[in-house]
């Protein structure tokens, strides 16, 4: 039975040129996390694997930094970064849990930053 839930930063906004932390947290399950994938629509951004550590997709290497924790930091934001981001938790024995974050990158300097989410 998949009892777990994913808490995410939800809908967030950030300024063009700035950076943002995408973070998810899996709770309410005894399942053990083996790997977390970060995806933007259908594009793989990064993988955090239990054995191999972090792998950032080559096309995002300059603008994506691993962490904090299982989260992901996006840097040098552009308006094209606006869209849906997914954290995909591969767990044993439950299987896959997916969380969704919507990021809006604003031209304006009055972008309201979503509350930063910290994994305990």
């Amino acid at each position: 039975m998949m009892t777990g839930t994913i808490e995410t930063t939800g809908n967030i906004s950030a300024e063009k040129g700035g950076s943002i932390i995408l973070q998810c947290h899996l709770s309410s399950t005894t399942a053990q996390v083996t790997q977390v994938n970060w995806e933007q629509q259908d594009q793989l951004l990064a993988i955090c694997n239990a054995d191999l550590g972090w792998h950032i997709s080559p096309s995002f290497k300059d603008r994506v930094a691993p962490g904090p924790g299982l989260g992901l930091t996006l840097q040098s934001l552009t308006v094209n970064d606006t869209g849906e981001y997914f954290c995909i938790y591969h767990t044993y024995p439950d299987g896959t849990y997916t969380g969704r974050i919507f990021l809006e990158v604003l031209e304006s300097s009055v972008a309201e930053h979503g509350a930063r989410f910290q994994i305990p």
């Epitope: 039975m1 005894t30 399942a31 053990q32 083996t34 239990a50 054995d51 044993y92 024995p93 439950d94």
Partner: antibody, heavy 119, light 109 residues
Framework: QVQLVQSGAEVKKPGASVKISCKAS????????MNWVRQAPGQGLEWMGW????????TYAQKFQGRFTFTLDTSTSTAYLEISSLRSEDTAVYYC????????????WGQGTLVTVSS | QAVVTQEPSLTVSPGGTVTLTCGSS?????????ANWVQQKPGQAFRGLIR???GRGSGVPARFSGSLLGGKAALTISGAQPEDEAEYYC?????????FGGGTKLTVL
């Protein structure tokens, strides 16, 4: 390379207890769950449950609640299965296997430990 | 509890293709059952071949593949080798526990 090495065969009397070990190497022990599976003579494989090696929380299959205990020693990357109040029907080969969440399942297995319960 | 069924025995010629199946008494097998296939040769430890329906284990030859076929999980060996002669067990996940099949004895002859 990943290896799960189990302790040697045991012969016990009914009512006694036994504790068998499964020592892991070749990977970070606390990153993967550990399962216990048994095979009684002439019987099929039965999943006994698993233990979260990060939190230490065990999950037991219904049939194996009560006399069976999963524990860990993370300092030595070892998982343990203890069976109390042994019965003749506990005679079996007990296997540990690693639980992987990326393509869910059991990817590496120990060689098995034969436990014989006989008066 | 669900019953998981496998062919008791199958025979394949060297270089031939064989498909082992794994069915559930509860209905069609789906990806949520995370079908696993493990191999056991006499006197050797179990070897994980396939996890999560179609995920090949590390070091497992490409001739082994997993899929869903006609409501069952399937293990296909394409170009069978003499060393593939072994017992093959499937396991299916049912919400909170694994159930193993009775095993298929594969002979390469």
């Amino acid at each position: 390379q990943v290896q799960l090495v189990q302790s040697g065969a045991e012969v016990k009397k009914p009512g006694a207890s036994v504790k068998i070990s499964c020592k892991a190497s070749g990977y970070t022990f606390t990153n993967y769950g550990m399962n216990w599976v048994r095979q009684a003579p002439g019987q099929g494989l039965e999943w006994m449950g698993w233990i979260n090696t990060y939190t230490g929380e065990p999950t037991y299959a219904q049939k194996f609640q009560g006399r069976f205990t999963f524990t860990l020693d993370t300092s030595t990357s070892t998982a343990y299965l203890e069976i109390s109040s042994l019965r003749s029907e506990d005679t079996a080969v007990y296997y540990c296997s690693r639980g992987n969440g990326y393509y869910v399942g059991m990817d590496y297995w120990g060689q098995g430990t034969l436990v014989t319960v006989s008066s | 509890q669900a019953v998981v069924t496998q062919e008791p025995s199958l025979t394949v010629s060297p270089g031939g293709t064989v498909t082992l199946t794994c069915g559930s008494s509860t209905g069609a097998v789906t990806t949520s059952n995370h079908a696993n296939w493990v191999q056991q040769k006499p006197g050797q430890a179990f070897r994980g071949l396939i996890r999560g329906t179609n995920g090949r284990g590390s070091g497992v030859p490409a001739r082994f593949s997993g899929s869903l076929l006609g409501g069952k999980a399937a293990l296909t060996i394409s170009g069978a080798q003499p060393e593939d002669e072994a017992e093959y067990y499937c396991a299916l996940w049912f919400s909170n526990h694994w159930v193993f099949g009775g095993g298929t004895k594969l002979t390469v002859l």
